[in-house]
């Protein structure tokens, strides 16, 4: 278990002392403090909060706390020229206009600087035309429209409902379909749970509530003007035409009241099936255009937002390790919010604050972790993970040599049903062991472990008696650490019951109604779920920083590699004739996975038996564990996605939020039956199998005996 030479606290009590110091009341107090005004990236208010956090982390006892600033591309609405969408008649008169701002929640009416709903990085434009309803604007939705229904979106304004996939993927898909504008809206089917009142009477989305968010397709690039390098004082910036990931057509988000006004007039084709119908009182006709009586009316977008290079500030706190100060365990979460950030991010930031306070208390009593712990309050996450990515770009050489693990700390809650964990397989055993030691906060599980309630409520689909742990995707600040640098990463939060609540995320996500009161009244009045998340995140950091042998189990990677190989093989086997014709074989991949499994097993045996009192051997074994994740990095990156370099995992090309396994092979196989040159397409499949097999074999060899 945890132990450390450099402490005056009895080793077996280290973790307990840390966990006992965490208090729900403090998290509540910090959340209140962080949510009274907006903290939009690039604003004075967020700079002031950065300085406040810096000051408080110093008071808590960290060795050093610095601000790291970067000048990155951000996006804001024009204050004097608001964005909106109109229905116009044949004379060009605006007969309906969407909202200019959300009705403010009670108690916040006089707060200034609430940014109105907008799609960050939308270009300016005033397109007008017929509307086409494209469901969730997923890849498969456009396939249905274009291939099955023969509906052409070229030159049309498309309206898509939020949910299922990252909004940036929706916009990319619309662009590829030839649309000239995109309207995003929240349908009650996805953002209004039955039987719950809308805010302020409950946690549902009101008709005037709108989800903000960026619509970039950065693919891990960070600041669009400085891909690969930090946006520092001497940075060379690309011109806006060469910027990474910017959308090319105007985009704007609306609430479901305004969506009803647009959708109720829709004509054209009926929805193809019930999966295209939401919960509004409209027919969900696909279009194009409005029905008979209204056929001369059009939709017009008025988008006047501007992209501006703006200074952002990360807060980086250091607690120096006593034994291995050159090994870094990082706990990071963002600070910037769209408005008040009641859940996203401040429910996470408040937990980080309390974790820092607890570590600081132990340090003041003379304790130090074995390894260095870095704490980060990231800026501009909402604008494309910019703060974390720029810092990692600036410190990449240190991180790739010294980075042990990264634990993410965005929103602590997206519900109050059970735990949700996404992490590298290396951390499975750490998470299992930790949650067995923690008390469950759930009703009906008094006196039971968190592991027990989690397993009961969210069972693993593969292994009975174990909880579900998901793959890491993206859409949060772990991206650069895991997908680009290959640092073992994980995240944990409390979530909803996905069985009964099919809406996407939580209803008030990125709206003005994401307030302190939302959390305190409806989600976690006792802050017991926040405390549990603090214990999980903090406990993981503690173990990673303090255990003599790193708490990574390489055998768990072997198990998932076999599962992923089986999955991708079965996808490929949907084309048996082509596999035969083009001599496609997965033998090399299965062979590499078998080798990995055997070598990992032997490594684990050696790990049990080696002399832990020999610091050189200990360091050698720990380095093999630390560098295993790194070994899955391909320096050339994935095709057309140079900053996604992990061969085993990448964000899905169709949904940034989701993780895909063997993404190179998966993307090569995707829709392969429609490729114009099958020989070339299957050649790319073969190349990707080769890359994957080589990478798995090379990673296995890093676990072999060194001589």
């Amino acid at each position: 278990k945890s132990s450390n030479e450099a402490t005056n606290i009895t080793p077996k009590h280290n973790m307990k002392a840390f966990l006992d110091e965490l208090k729900a009341e403090n998290i509540k107090k910090f959340l209140y403090n962080f949510t009274q005004i907006p903290h939009l990236a690039g604003t004075e208010q967020n700079f002031q909060l950065a300085k406040q956090i810096q000051s408080q982390w110093k008071e808590f006892g960290l060795d050093s706390v610095e601000l790291a600033h970067y000048d990155v591309l951000l996006s804001y609405p024009n204050k004097t020229h608001p964005n909106y969408i109109s229905i116009i008649n044949e004379d060009g008169n605006e007969i309906f206009n969407t909202s200019l701002f959300e009705p403010p929640p009670p108690g916040y009416e006089n707060v200034s600087d609430i940014v109105p709903p907008f799609s960050a990085f939308s270009p300016q434009g005033m397109p007008e035309g017929d509307l086409v309803y494209v469901n969730y604007a997923r890849t498969e939705d456009f396939f249905k429209l274009e291939r099955d229904m023969k509906i052409n979106c070229s030159g049309k304004i498309v309206i898509a409902r939020y949910g299922k996939v990252f909004r940036g993927n929706k916009v990319k898909n619309a662009q590829l379909a030839g649309a000239k504008g995109v309207i995003l809206y929240s349908d009650p089917a996805d953002y209004f749970a039955p039987g719950v009142k809308s805010y302020p009477d409950g946690w549902n989305l009101p008709g005037g509530g709108v989800q903000r968010g960026n619509i970039l397709n950065l693919n891990g690039a960070g600041d669009p003007l400085t891909p690969g390098y930090p946006a520092n004082e001497y940075a060379y910036r690309r011109g806006i035409a060469e910027a990474v990931g910017l959308p090319s057509i105007p985009v704007h988000p609306i609430g479901y009241y305004d969506a009803q006004k647009l959708l109720e007039k829709m004509g054209g084709s009926a929805p193809p099936d019930s999966s295209w119908r939401g919960s509004l009182k409209v027919p969900y006709n696909v279009g194009p255009g409005f029905t008979g009586n209204f056929s001369t009316q059009k939709v017009k977008m008025h988008i006047h937002s501007t992209n501006e290079v703006t200074r952002i500030y990360n807060v980086i706190g250091t607690l120096r390790g006593a034994v291995e100060p050159d090994r870094y365990v990082i706990l990071g979460g963002h600070r910037d919010s769209w408005v008040f950030g009641g859940i996203d991010p401040q429910s996470g930031a408040a937990v980080v604050h309390e974790i820092v306070r607890s570590f600081g208390t132990l340090k003041k009593e003379g304790w130090r972790p074995r390894r260095t712990i870095l704490f980060a309050s990231w800026d501009a996450e909402e604008f494309g993970l910019l703060g974390s990515t720029e810092w990692a770009e600036e410190n990449s050489r240190l991180l790739q040599e010294r980075g042990v693990a990264y634990i993410n700390a965005d929103s602590s809650i997206e519900g109050n049903y059970t735990l949700r964990v996404d992490c590298t397989p290396l951390m499975y055993s750490l998470v299992h062991n930790l949650t067995k030691e923690l008390k469950s906060p759930d009703e009906g599980f008094e006196g039971k472990s968190l592991y027990e309630s989690w397993t009961k409520k969210s069972p693993s689909p593969e292994f009975s008696g174990m909880p579900r742990i998901s793959k890491l995707g993206s859409g949060n600040d772990f991206e650069v650490f895991f997908q680009r640098l290959g640092i073992a990463s994980g995240r944990a939060r409390y979530t909803k019951n996905w069985e009964t609540n099919k809406f996407s995320g939580y209803p008030l996500y990125h709206s003005v109604y994401e307030t302190y009161e939302l959390v305190e009244k409806f989600y976690d009045p006792m802050f017991k779920y926040h405390l549990t998340v603090a214990q999980v995140r903090g406990g993981m950091v503690f173990e990673l920083a303090n255990s003599i042998v790193l708490p990574f189990d390489c055998r768990d990677y072997a198990v998932v590699l076999r599962k992923y190989a089986d999955k991708i093989y079965s996808i490929s086997m949907k084309h048996p004739q082509e596999m035969k014709t083009y001599s496609v074989s997965f033998d090399s991949l299965f062979s590499a996975v078998k080798n990995f499994t055997e070598i990992a097993s032997k490594f684990s045996e050696r790990l049990q038996d080696f002399d832990k009192s020999n610091p050189i051997v200990l360091r050698m074994m720990n380095d093999q564990l630390m560098f295993l994740e790194r070994a899955f990095i391909d320096p050339l990156g994935l095709p057309d996605r140079p900053f996604y370099r992990h061969v085993i995992y990448a964000p899905s090309s169709h949904n940034k939020y989701a993780g895909e396994s063997f993404p190179g092979i998966y993307d090569a196989l995707f829709d392969i039956e429609s490729k114009v040159d099958p020989s070339k397409a299957w050649g790319e499949v073969k190349r990707q199998i080769y890359v994957a097999a080589f990478t798995v074999q090379a990673a296995a060899e890093t676990l072999s005996e060194v001589a």
């Epitope: 309906f96 206009n97 009101p206 005037g208 009241y257 006004k261 007039k265 009182k281």
Partner: antibody, heavy 120, light 107 residues
Framework: QVQLVESGGGVVQPGRSLRLSCAAS????????MNWVRQAPGKGLEWVAI????????YYADSVKGRFTISRDISKNTLYLQMNSLRAEDTAVYYC?????????????WGQGTTVTVSS | SYELMQPPSVSVSPGQTARITCSGD??????AYWYQQKPGQAPVLVIY???ERPSGIPVRFSGSSSGTTVTLTITGVQAEDEADYYC??????????FGTGTKVTVL
């Protein structure tokens, strides 16, 4: 407590003008759409006009379009109805009523009404 | 212009169920609202969004919707329920309209 109080009614000759006011208190005026609804003697309710909470839309019943104008002063928490070219058929009790902005909660708070009589 | 049609009157004995209908072409695409108005008083909202009941409204009031017709049901009518009832909805041009009104008499 939440309250709407109409004023400005009275007797006016056909063709003349009148301005009604509705003073709001006890709630955030800027978060609510505001309506004028009228009721002629012995008749049913007739919707007259709406102004959205953010000022983005104003709509009128066909019977008053071009003659009546709805407006508001956020700083004074007051809704107005400017009535020009009044006709005998505009004689009614005029109510102001609020509804939560861009939502489906209906007109949940009404004033007590002010009477307008158009007569020569 | 768009109309919402209601029966002029409904009579019901105490404890019985009263049903008031409201018909309009736009109702499949528009939510309906019901208001109760007693003599000399301002209207009171009793049902919103077809079938939702505001706080403070007795559970005996309920609403339903089917095609071009919405219905207000008063289950177990009481003497104080005697009043005029109006449905209200919108049309696709953004304007609102009230129904013709129904006088409920409790026998």
């Amino acid at each position: 407590q939440v309250q709407l109080v109409e004023s400005g009614g009275g007797v006016v000759q056909p063709g003349r003008s009148l301005r009604l006011s509705c003073a709001a208190s006890g709630f955030t005026f800027s978060s609510y759409n505001m309506n004028w609804v009228r009721q002629a003697p012995g008749k049913g309710l007739e919707w007259v006009a709406i102004i959205y909470y953010d000022g983005s839309n104003k709509y009128y019943a066909d019977s008053v379009k071009g003659r009546f104008t709805i407006s508001r002063d956020i700083s004074k928490n007051t809704l107005y109805l400017q009535m020009n070219s009044l006709r005998a058929e505009d004689t009614a009790v005029y109510y102001c009523a609020r509804e939560r902005g861009r939502d489906y909660y209906g007109m949940d708070v009404w004033g007590q009404g002010t009477t307008v009589t158009v007569s020569s | 212009s768009y109309e919402l049609m209601q029966p002029p009157s409904v009579s019901v004995s105490p404890g019985q169920t009263a049903r008031i209908t409201c018909s309009g072409d736009a109702l499949p695409k528009q939510y309906a609202y019901w208001y109760q108005q007693k003599p000399g008083q301002a209207p009171v909202l009793v049902i919103y969004k077809d079938s939702e009941r505001p706080s403070g409204i007795p559970v005996r009031f309920s609403g339903s919707s089917s095609g071009t017709t919405v219905t207000l049901t008063i289950t177990g009518v009481q003497a104080e329920d005697e009043a005029d009832y109006y449905c209200q909805s919108a049309d696709s041009s953004g304007t609102y309209v009230f129904g013709t009104g129904t006088k409920v008499t409790v026998l």
